[in-house]
Interface confidence: medium
Protein backbone atom coordinates (compact mmCIF):
# COMPACT_ATOMS: atom_id res chain seq x y z
CA UNK A 1 0.00 0.00 0.00
CA UNK A 2 1.27 3.47 -0.93
CA UNK A 3 -0.43 6.65 0.30
CA UNK A 4 0.38 10.03 -1.22
CA UNK A 5 2.07 12.53 1.05
CA UNK A 6 3.21 15.73 -0.62
CA UNK A 7 4.79 16.84 -3.86
CA UNK A 8 7.74 19.05 -4.68
CA UNK A 9 9.14 20.56 -7.85
CA UNK A 10 12.66 19.46 -8.72
CA UNK A 11 15.37 19.57 -11.34
CA UNK A 12 17.10 16.20 -11.77
CA UNK A 13 20.68 15.95 -13.03
CA UNK A 14 23.04 13.07 -13.71
CA UNK A 15 26.55 13.15 -12.30
CA UNK A 16 27.84 14.76 -15.49
CA UNK A 17 25.57 17.69 -14.56
CA UNK A 18 23.29 17.07 -17.53
CA UNK A 19 19.67 18.03 -16.92
CA UNK A 20 16.78 15.58 -17.28
CA UNK A 21 13.98 16.83 -19.51
CA UNK A 22 11.08 15.40 -21.45
CA UNK A 23 11.37 16.00 -25.19
CA UNK A 24 8.58 16.70 -27.70
CA UNK A 25 8.18 12.97 -28.18
CA UNK A 26 7.67 12.46 -24.43
CA UNK A 27 11.09 10.80 -24.08
CA UNK A 28 13.12 11.42 -20.91
CA UNK A 29 16.57 12.59 -22.00
CA UNK A 30 19.60 14.27 -20.44
CA UNK A 31 21.25 17.28 -22.00
CA UNK A 32 23.85 19.90 -21.12
CA UNK A 33 22.00 23.05 -20.10
CA UNK A 34 22.89 26.34 -18.50
CA UNK A 35 20.62 27.59 -15.71
CA UNK A 36 19.12 29.93 -18.26
CA UNK A 37 18.46 27.01 -20.69
CA UNK A 38 16.89 25.12 -17.83
CA UNK A 39 14.47 27.97 -17.12
CA UNK A 40 13.72 28.51 -20.81
CA UNK A 41 12.86 24.82 -21.24
CA UNK A 42 10.49 24.72 -18.28
CA UNK A 43 8.14 22.99 -17.63
CA UNK A 44 9.91 20.19 -19.53
CA UNK A 45 12.84 20.39 -17.10
CA UNK A 46 10.74 20.65 -13.94
CA UNK A 47 9.70 17.34 -12.44
CA UNK A 48 7.07 16.82 -9.78
CA UNK A 49 8.35 14.38 -7.19
CA UNK A 50 5.30 12.95 -5.47
CA UNK A 51 6.20 11.38 -2.13
CA UNK A 52 4.32 8.39 -0.77
CA UNK A 53 4.05 6.64 2.57
CA UNK A 54 4.99 2.97 2.15
CA UNK A 55 3.20 0.46 4.35
CA UNK A 56 6.36 -1.69 4.16
CA UNK A 57 9.11 0.86 4.89
CA UNK A 58 11.71 0.47 2.15
CA UNK A 59 12.83 4.05 1.65
CA UNK A 60 11.02 7.16 0.49
CA UNK A 61 8.55 6.03 -2.17
CA UNK A 62 8.11 8.52 -5.03
CA UNK A 63 6.34 8.89 -8.34
CA UNK A 64 7.92 11.27 -10.86
CA UNK A 65 5.64 13.41 -13.01
CA UNK A 66 5.90 16.29 -15.42
CA UNK A 67 3.20 18.78 -16.41
CA UNK A 68 3.38 19.99 -19.98
CA UNK A 69 -0.02 20.19 -21.65
CA UNK A 70 -1.16 17.35 -19.41
CA UNK A 71 0.38 15.50 -16.49
CA UNK A 72 2.51 12.49 -17.40
CA UNK A 73 4.03 10.09 -14.91
CA UNK A 74 7.18 8.02 -15.25
CA UNK A 75 6.56 4.29 -15.59
CA UNK A 76 8.84 1.27 -15.85
CA UNK A 77 6.27 -1.18 -17.14
CA UNK A 78 8.01 -4.27 -18.55
CA UNK A 79 11.30 -2.62 -17.48
CA UNK A 80 10.87 0.00 -20.21
CA UNK A 81 10.96 3.63 -19.13
CA UNK A 82 8.22 5.83 -20.52
CA UNK A 83 5.95 8.67 -19.48
CA UNK A 84 2.29 7.71 -19.28
CA UNK A 85 -0.46 10.32 -19.42
CA UNK A 86 -1.81 10.01 -15.88
CA UNK A 87 -1.97 11.74 -12.52
CA UNK A 88 -0.19 9.93 -9.69
CA UNK A 89 -3.07 8.54 -7.59
CA UNK A 90 -3.62 9.39 -3.93
CA UNK A 91 -3.52 5.71 -2.99
CA UNK A 92 -2.05 2.58 -4.56
CA UNK A 93 -3.36 -0.62 -3.00
CA UNK A 94 -0.37 -2.82 -3.77
CA UNK A 95 3.19 -3.32 -2.54
CA UNK A 96 4.58 -2.80 -6.06
CA UNK A 97 3.78 -0.32 -8.78
CA UNK A 98 5.34 0.55 -12.12
CA UNK A 99 5.19 4.25 -11.20
CA UNK A 100 6.68 3.97 -7.69
CA UNK A 101 10.43 4.20 -7.09
CA UNK A 102 12.33 4.19 -3.82
CA UNK A 103 14.44 7.33 -3.56
CA UNK A 104 17.48 6.75 -1.36
CA UNK A 105 20.64 8.70 -0.74
CA UNK A 106 23.90 7.06 -1.78
CA UNK A 107 25.76 5.91 1.36
CA UNK A 108 28.42 8.48 2.17
CA UNK A 109 26.99 10.95 -0.36
CA UNK A 110 23.84 12.48 1.16
CA UNK A 111 23.30 14.79 -1.83
CA UNK A 112 23.37 11.99 -4.41
CA UNK A 113 20.20 9.99 -4.98
CA UNK A 114 19.28 6.71 -6.56
CA UNK A 115 15.83 5.47 -7.56
CA UNK A 116 15.02 1.76 -7.28
CA UNK A 117 11.92 0.38 -8.98
CA UNK A 118 9.29 -0.98 -6.60
CA UNK A 119 8.19 -3.42 -9.30
CA UNK A 120 11.63 -4.76 -10.22
CA UNK A 121 13.87 -5.20 -7.20
CA UNK A 122 17.50 -4.40 -7.95
CA UNK A 123 16.63 -2.29 -10.99
CA UNK A 124 17.41 1.43 -10.88
CA UNK A 125 16.83 4.52 -12.97
CA UNK A 126 20.04 5.21 -14.87
CA UNK A 127 21.49 7.42 -17.58
CA UNK A 128 22.78 5.59 -20.64
CA UNK A 129 24.27 6.96 -23.85
CA UNK A 130 22.68 5.62 -27.03
CA UNK A 131 24.33 7.02 -30.15
CA UNK A 132 24.20 10.78 -29.56
CA UNK A 133 21.43 10.72 -26.97
CA UNK A 134 21.64 10.36 -23.20
CA UNK A 135 18.56 8.41 -22.18
CA UNK A 136 16.85 7.63 -18.89
CA UNK A 137 16.60 3.84 -18.64
CA UNK A 138 15.94 1.13 -16.06
CA UNK A 139 19.10 -0.79 -15.29
CA UNK A 140 19.99 -3.71 -13.06
CA UNK A 141 22.56 -2.59 -10.53
CA UNK A 142 25.61 -4.69 -11.24
CA UNK A 143 28.51 -2.95 -9.54
CA UNK A 144 29.29 -0.84 -6.50
CA UNK A 145 29.78 2.85 -7.17
CA UNK A 146 27.97 2.79 -10.53
CA UNK A 147 27.74 6.51 -11.32
CA UNK A 148 25.08 6.01 -14.00
CA UNK A 149 22.43 5.32 -11.34
CA UNK A 150 23.28 8.38 -9.24
CA UNK A 151 21.50 11.70 -9.58
CA UNK A 152 21.22 15.05 -7.87
CA UNK A 153 17.78 16.42 -7.10
CA UNK A 154 17.46 20.18 -6.77
CA UNK A 155 14.39 21.47 -4.98
CA UNK A 156 12.70 24.20 -7.05
CA UNK A 157 9.69 24.99 -4.85
Amino acid sequence: YFGKLESKLSIIRNLNDQVLFIDQGNRPLFEDMTDSDCRDNAPRTIFIINMYKDSQPRGMAVAISVKCEKISTLSCENRIISFKEMNPPDNIKDTKSDIIFFQRSVPGHDNKMQFESSSYEGYFLACEKERDLYKLILKKKDELGDRSIMFTVQNED
Epitope: G3, K4, L5, E6, S7, M51, M60, D90, N155, D157
Partner: antibody
Protein backbone atom coordinates in the same frame (compact mmCIF):
# COMPACT_ATOMS: atom_id res chain seq x y z
CA UNK B 1 1.29 37.53 1.03
CA UNK B 2 0.81 33.99 2.32
CA UNK B 3 -1.57 33.74 5.26
CA UNK B 4 -2.89 30.83 7.29
CA UNK B 5 -5.58 31.72 9.83
CA UNK B 6 -6.77 29.12 12.33
CA UNK B 7 -10.11 29.30 14.13
CA UNK B 8 -12.38 27.10 16.23
CA UNK B 9 -10.32 26.75 19.38
CA UNK B 10 -11.64 27.27 22.88
CA UNK B 11 -12.65 25.40 26.03
CA UNK B 12 -14.17 21.94 25.78
CA UNK B 13 -14.93 19.25 28.35
CA UNK B 14 -13.11 15.88 28.36
CA UNK B 15 -14.85 13.51 25.97
CA UNK B 16 -16.17 16.40 23.93
CA UNK B 17 -15.61 17.38 20.30
CA UNK B 18 -14.27 20.41 18.46
CA UNK B 19 -13.55 21.32 14.85
CA UNK B 20 -10.63 23.54 13.90
CA UNK B 21 -10.46 25.39 10.59
CA UNK B 22 -7.50 26.94 8.80
CA UNK B 23 -8.24 29.37 5.99
CA UNK B 24 -5.40 29.87 3.49
CA UNK B 25 -4.67 32.78 1.16
CA UNK B 26 -1.78 34.07 -0.92
CA UNK B 27 -0.85 30.73 -2.52
CA UNK B 28 -2.41 27.99 -4.61
CA UNK B 29 -3.90 25.92 -1.80
CA UNK B 30 -4.59 22.77 -3.80
CA UNK B 31 -0.92 22.44 -4.80
CA UNK B 32 0.28 21.83 -1.24
CA UNK B 33 0.02 19.09 1.31
CA UNK B 34 -0.96 20.57 4.67
CA UNK B 35 -0.60 19.57 8.29
CA UNK B 36 -1.56 20.27 11.88
CA UNK B 37 1.11 20.59 14.57
CA UNK B 38 0.38 21.20 18.25
CA UNK B 39 2.27 22.52 21.26
CA UNK B 40 1.12 21.89 24.82
CA UNK B 41 1.75 24.80 27.22
CA UNK B 42 5.47 24.96 28.02
CA UNK B 43 6.17 21.83 25.98
CA UNK B 44 7.65 20.96 22.60
CA UNK B 45 6.17 20.61 19.11
CA UNK B 46 4.17 17.50 18.18
CA UNK B 47 3.12 16.64 14.64
CA UNK B 48 -0.59 15.72 14.71
CA UNK B 49 -1.82 15.03 11.19
CA UNK B 50 -1.12 15.60 7.50
CA UNK B 51 -3.12 15.48 4.29
CA UNK B 52 -2.17 15.19 0.62
CA UNK B 53 -3.06 17.78 -2.01
CA UNK B 54 -6.22 16.01 -3.15
CA UNK B 55 -7.23 14.89 0.33
CA UNK B 56 -7.03 11.17 -0.41
CA UNK B 57 -3.92 10.61 1.70
CA UNK B 58 -4.49 11.28 5.42
CA UNK B 59 -2.01 10.55 8.21
CA UNK B 60 -2.06 10.76 11.99
CA UNK B 61 0.21 10.62 14.98
CA UNK B 62 -0.36 7.50 17.10
CA UNK B 63 -1.61 9.71 19.95
CA UNK B 64 -4.64 10.94 17.94
CA UNK B 65 -5.30 8.04 15.54
CA UNK B 66 -8.98 7.09 15.59
CA UNK B 67 -10.03 10.26 17.42
CA UNK B 68 -9.02 13.05 15.03
CA UNK B 69 -9.92 13.45 11.34
CA UNK B 70 -8.12 15.79 8.95
CA UNK B 71 -9.85 17.00 5.79
CA UNK B 72 -9.70 19.85 3.31
CA UNK B 73 -12.01 21.73 0.99
CA UNK B 74 -9.89 23.01 -1.88
CA UNK B 75 -12.78 25.05 -3.27
CA UNK B 76 -12.82 27.03 0.00
CA UNK B 77 -9.04 27.05 0.56
CA UNK B 78 -9.69 25.56 3.97
CA UNK B 79 -8.10 22.83 6.08
CA UNK B 80 -10.02 21.17 8.93
CA UNK B 81 -9.27 19.09 12.00
CA UNK B 82 -12.23 17.31 13.59
CA UNK B 83 -11.30 16.33 17.14
CA UNK B 84 -13.46 13.82 19.03
CA UNK B 85 -13.12 12.09 22.43
CA UNK B 86 -10.90 14.92 23.61
CA UNK B 87 -8.60 14.37 26.58
CA UNK B 88 -6.80 16.73 28.96
CA UNK B 89 -3.52 15.88 27.22
CA UNK B 90 -4.91 17.30 23.95
CA UNK B 91 -4.72 20.79 25.49
CA UNK B 92 -2.37 22.76 23.24
CA UNK B 93 -1.95 25.51 20.71
CA UNK B 94 -2.80 23.98 17.33
CA UNK B 95 -0.98 25.32 14.26
CA UNK B 96 -1.72 24.62 10.62
CA UNK B 97 1.34 24.60 8.38
CA UNK B 98 2.55 24.17 4.79
CA UNK B 99 4.42 22.24 3.60
CA UNK B 100 5.07 19.63 6.19
CA UNK B 101 7.51 17.01 5.02
CA UNK B 102 10.25 18.15 2.70
CA UNK B 103 10.45 21.86 3.41
CA UNK B 104 11.07 24.24 0.57
CA UNK B 105 13.40 26.89 -0.74
CA UNK B 106 10.64 29.45 -0.27
CA UNK B 107 10.42 28.53 3.40
CA UNK B 108 7.28 27.33 5.04
CA UNK B 109 4.24 29.02 6.50
CA UNK B 110 2.46 28.59 9.82
CA UNK B 111 -0.68 30.10 11.19
CA UNK B 112 -0.69 32.06 14.43
CA UNK B 113 -2.17 29.07 16.27
CA UNK B 114 -5.45 28.50 18.08
CA UNK B 115 -5.60 27.37 21.71
CA UNK B 116 -7.63 24.28 22.58
CA UNK B 117 -8.23 23.73 26.31
CA UNK B 118 -9.72 20.42 27.44
CA UNK B 119 -10.88 20.77 31.03
CA UNK B 120 -13.90 20.15 33.20
CA UNK C 1 7.27 6.81 18.16
CA UNK C 2 9.66 8.58 20.55
CA UNK C 3 10.72 12.16 19.95
CA UNK C 4 14.17 12.73 18.53
CA UNK C 5 16.72 13.46 21.25
CA UNK C 6 18.15 16.97 21.61
CA UNK C 7 20.10 18.57 24.46
CA UNK C 8 17.73 20.48 26.73
CA UNK C 9 19.87 23.61 26.63
CA UNK C 10 22.99 25.10 25.10
CA UNK C 11 24.59 28.48 25.57
CA UNK C 12 27.22 30.65 23.97
CA UNK C 13 28.56 34.17 23.91
CA UNK C 14 27.94 36.65 21.09
CA UNK C 15 30.20 35.90 18.13
CA UNK C 16 30.78 32.28 19.14
CA UNK C 17 29.57 29.19 17.29
CA UNK C 18 27.35 26.53 18.83
CA UNK C 19 26.10 23.16 17.59
CA UNK C 20 22.83 21.46 18.53
CA UNK C 21 22.57 17.71 17.98
CA UNK C 22 19.47 15.70 17.09
CA UNK C 23 19.72 11.94 17.54
CA UNK C 24 17.27 9.47 16.09
CA UNK C 25 17.42 6.01 14.55
CA UNK C 26 17.84 4.41 11.14
CA UNK C 27 14.03 4.62 10.82
CA UNK C 28 14.06 8.41 10.85
CA UNK C 29 17.14 10.67 10.85
CA UNK C 30 19.52 7.97 9.63
CA UNK C 31 17.25 6.57 6.96
CA UNK C 32 16.04 9.69 5.18
CA UNK C 33 17.25 13.12 4.12
CA UNK C 34 14.04 14.76 5.31
CA UNK C 35 15.47 16.43 8.39
CA UNK C 36 14.41 20.01 9.16
CA UNK C 37 15.33 22.56 11.83
CA UNK C 38 13.00 25.18 13.30
CA UNK C 39 13.53 28.25 15.44
CA UNK C 40 10.78 29.35 17.82
CA UNK C 41 10.72 32.55 19.84
CA UNK C 42 8.37 32.70 22.88
CA UNK C 43 4.72 33.12 21.89
CA UNK C 44 5.50 32.86 18.17
CA UNK C 45 4.98 30.19 15.52
CA UNK C 46 8.05 28.13 14.52
CA UNK C 47 10.19 29.31 11.62
CA UNK C 48 11.94 26.92 9.21
CA UNK C 49 15.74 27.35 9.25
CA UNK C 50 16.95 24.22 7.42
CA UNK C 51 15.20 21.62 5.28
CA UNK C 52 16.42 18.35 3.79
CA UNK C 53 19.39 18.18 6.18
CA UNK C 54 21.40 21.14 4.91
CA UNK C 55 19.30 23.39 2.64
CA UNK C 56 18.47 26.93 3.73
CA UNK C 57 15.24 28.62 2.64
CA UNK C 58 15.67 32.02 1.04
CA UNK C 59 15.85 34.75 3.65
CA UNK C 60 17.51 32.57 6.30
CA UNK C 61 20.95 33.79 7.34
CA UNK C 62 23.95 31.77 6.20
CA UNK C 63 25.05 31.70 9.85
CA UNK C 64 22.71 28.70 10.14
CA UNK C 65 23.92 25.42 8.66
CA UNK C 66 22.83 21.79 8.90
CA UNK C 67 24.53 18.45 8.49
CA UNK C 68 23.99 14.77 9.23
CA UNK C 69 26.16 11.80 10.13
CA UNK C 70 24.57 8.42 10.65
CA UNK C 71 21.56 8.73 12.96
CA UNK C 72 22.50 12.20 14.21
CA UNK C 73 21.72 15.53 12.58
CA UNK C 74 23.31 18.80 13.68
CA UNK C 75 22.48 22.50 13.49
CA UNK C 76 25.39 24.92 13.73
CA UNK C 77 24.90 28.62 14.41
CA UNK C 78 27.98 30.73 13.83
CA UNK C 79 28.55 34.32 14.93
CA UNK C 80 25.94 34.09 17.69
CA UNK C 81 23.69 37.13 18.06
CA UNK C 82 21.34 38.12 20.85
CA UNK C 83 18.30 37.53 18.62
CA UNK C 84 19.31 33.87 18.19
CA UNK C 85 18.13 33.21 21.75
CA UNK C 86 15.14 30.92 21.20
CA UNK C 87 14.01 27.30 21.21
CA UNK C 88 15.25 25.06 18.39
CA UNK C 89 13.57 21.89 17.16
CA UNK C 90 14.66 19.26 14.67
CA UNK C 91 12.17 17.12 12.81
CA UNK C 92 12.31 14.13 10.52
CA UNK C 93 10.22 11.89 8.34
CA UNK C 94 9.92 8.49 9.99
CA UNK C 95 8.98 5.11 8.58
CA UNK C 96 7.03 4.34 11.75
CA UNK C 97 3.26 4.70 11.75
CA UNK C 98 3.54 8.25 13.12
CA UNK C 99 5.15 9.38 9.84
CA UNK C 100 6.73 12.57 11.18
CA UNK C 101 8.50 13.32 14.43
CA UNK C 102 9.93 16.40 16.16
CA UNK C 103 12.89 16.62 18.49
CA UNK C 104 12.57 17.30 22.21
CA UNK C 105 13.71 20.90 21.70
CA UNK C 106 16.78 22.86 22.78
CA UNK C 107 16.76 26.21 24.56
CA UNK C 108 19.60 28.42 23.30
CA UNK C 109 20.82 31.10 25.68
CA UNK C 110 23.09 33.85 24.39
CA UNK C 111 25.21 34.93 27.36
Amino acid sequence: EVQLVESGGGLVQPGGSMRLSCTASGFTFDEYAMSWVRQAPGKGLEWVSGISTGGGGTYYADSVEGRFTISRDNSKNTLYLQMNSLRAEDTAVYYCAKPWLSGSRSGDFWGQGTLVTVSS
Amino acid sequence: QSALTQPASVSGSPGQSITISCTGTSSDVGGYNYVSWYQQHPGKAPKLLIYEVSHRPSGVSDRFSGSKSGNTASLTISGLQAEDEADYYCSSFTSSSSLYVFGTGTKLTVL
